[in-house]
Interface confidence: low
């Protein structure tokens, strides 16, 4: 088998999937202590490009709730308050790391799963296809 | 304690920190599959509030490497190509969970941890405070 | 483009010494912890040494201990493995790799030197 030198602190594996099976704590770690607690929290109404969030919810994930922004209109809020559809309001999103239980319904164990999330809109000048 | 229903198939954990300590599979699961994979490529340029991407490496993390959203400017482009000071740029955050080593340079063994990452920008209406 | 390329493989008797070598490129080499990997012939992959970004911490397998020495020289981009007192189980192609997160999901190899231990 394939013997790892290692700091002499480390955990032992004697998984058989070893070393595609690691030990993961999941006492979280937060490094964002010095962030401002309402962040984005109101620029989703206050955006040129509106959104809305919709829960994501899944047991056999973790985190098991995902919010999902989706944008309120195809175009952009203008100077006026009204809608200008020569302006379009698009999703950002970012692939993000989950974790899955697995085999399913397993309290310890997970499979590492790669998700795309939509985490708010912004408002982008449309690419235009002139026909000729 | 609390007692977890579990799969006949799962995994049995002998570590000491069970439950805070779990088993996760790195063969990565890619939801992924039918996004277009230039997704949010090009918006950083065509966005009213654009943005730069600036490179975080730090090899002892999973994913090593995190692109961070940086808004270009305080104001928004507004419809001639210029900033707008009336209107600003914010960066859309979003908590992410990462794979830390611990103890460092265990093969076998991370930690799980929460960081704050910009996105992308959005063009917001400011808050404006009036003095009396 | 990330390239590694390594050297100084080749017969030796038992009880003998070589050198490896690694030269590295296409990435920040300083920022990575570096790892030796061998393979004997119809077995699978043996991590051998790593060694810390700044070369301060140095792990390897038990049966290395004593007669192995990995280095590295993040001026020149390089790195090394001081191998003595070789016997006949230490033939193996060894392969040099630079180490992400997951170690033994390594992003790249090089193509790897063979070292040959026989009388």
């Known amino acids: 088998g394939i013997t790892i030198p290692r700091n002499p602190g480390c955990p032992n594996s004697e998984d058989k999937n070893f070393p595609r099976t690691v030990m993961v704590n999941l006492n979280i770690h937060n490094r964002n202590t010095n962030t401002n607690p309402k962040r984005s929290s109101d620029y989703y109404n206050r955006s040129t490009s509106p959104w809305n969030l919709h829960r994501n919810e899944d047991p056999e994930r973790y985190p098991s709730v995902i919010w999902e922004a989706k944008c309120r209109h195809l175009g952009c809020i203008n100077a006026d308050g009204n809608v200008d559809y020569h302006m379009n309001s698009v999703p950002i999103q970012q692939e993000i790391l989950v974790l899955r239980r697995e085999p399913p319904h397993c309290p310890n164990s997970f499979r590492l799963e790669k998700i795309l999330v939509s985490v708010g809109c912004t408002c982008v000048t449309p690419i235009v296809h002139h026909v000729a | 304690g609390i007692t977890i229903p579990r799969n006949p198939g799962c995994p049995n954990s002998e570590d000491k920190n069970f439950p805070r300590t779990v088993m996760v599979n790195l063969n990565i699961h890619n939801r992924n599959t039918n996004t277009n994979p230039k997704r949010s490529s090009d918006y950083y340029n065509r966005s009213t509030s654009p943005w730069n991407l600036h490179r975080n490496e730090d090899p002892e993390r999973y994913p090593s490497v995190i692109w961070e959203a940086k808004c270009r400017h305080l104001g928004c482009i507004n419809a001639d190509g210029n900033v707008d000071y009336h209107m600003n740029s914010v960066p859309i955050q979003q908590e992410i969970l990462v794979l830390r080593r611990e103890p460092p340079h265990c093969p076998n063994s991370f930690r799980l941890e929460k960081i704050l990452v910009s996105v992308g920008c959005t063009c917001v209406t400011p808050i404006v405070h009036h003095v009396a | 483009e990330v390239q590694l390329v390594e050297s100084g493989g080749g017969l030796v008797q038992p009880g003998g010494s070589l050198r490896l070598s690694c030269a590295a490129s296409?990435?920040?080499?300083?920022?990575?912890?570096m790892y030796w990997v061998r393979q004997a012939p119809g077995k699978g992959l043996e991590w051998v040494a790593s060694?810390?970004?700044?070369?301060?911490?140095?792990y390897y397998v038990d049966s290395v201990k004593g007669r192995f020495t990995i280095s590295r020289d993040n001026a020149k981009n390089s790195l090394f493995l001081q191998m003595n007192s070789l016997r006949a189980e230490d033939t193996a192609v060894y392969y040099c790799?630079?180490?992400?997160?997951?170690?033994?999901?390594?992003?790249?190899w090089g193509q790897g030197t063979l070292v040959t231990v026989s009388s």
């Open positions: 790799a630079k180490g992400e997160i997951l170690p033994l999901y390594f992003d790249y």
């Open positions: 296409g990435f920040t080499f300083s920022s990575y912890q």
């Open positions: 060694i810390k970004q700044d070369g301060s911490e140095e």
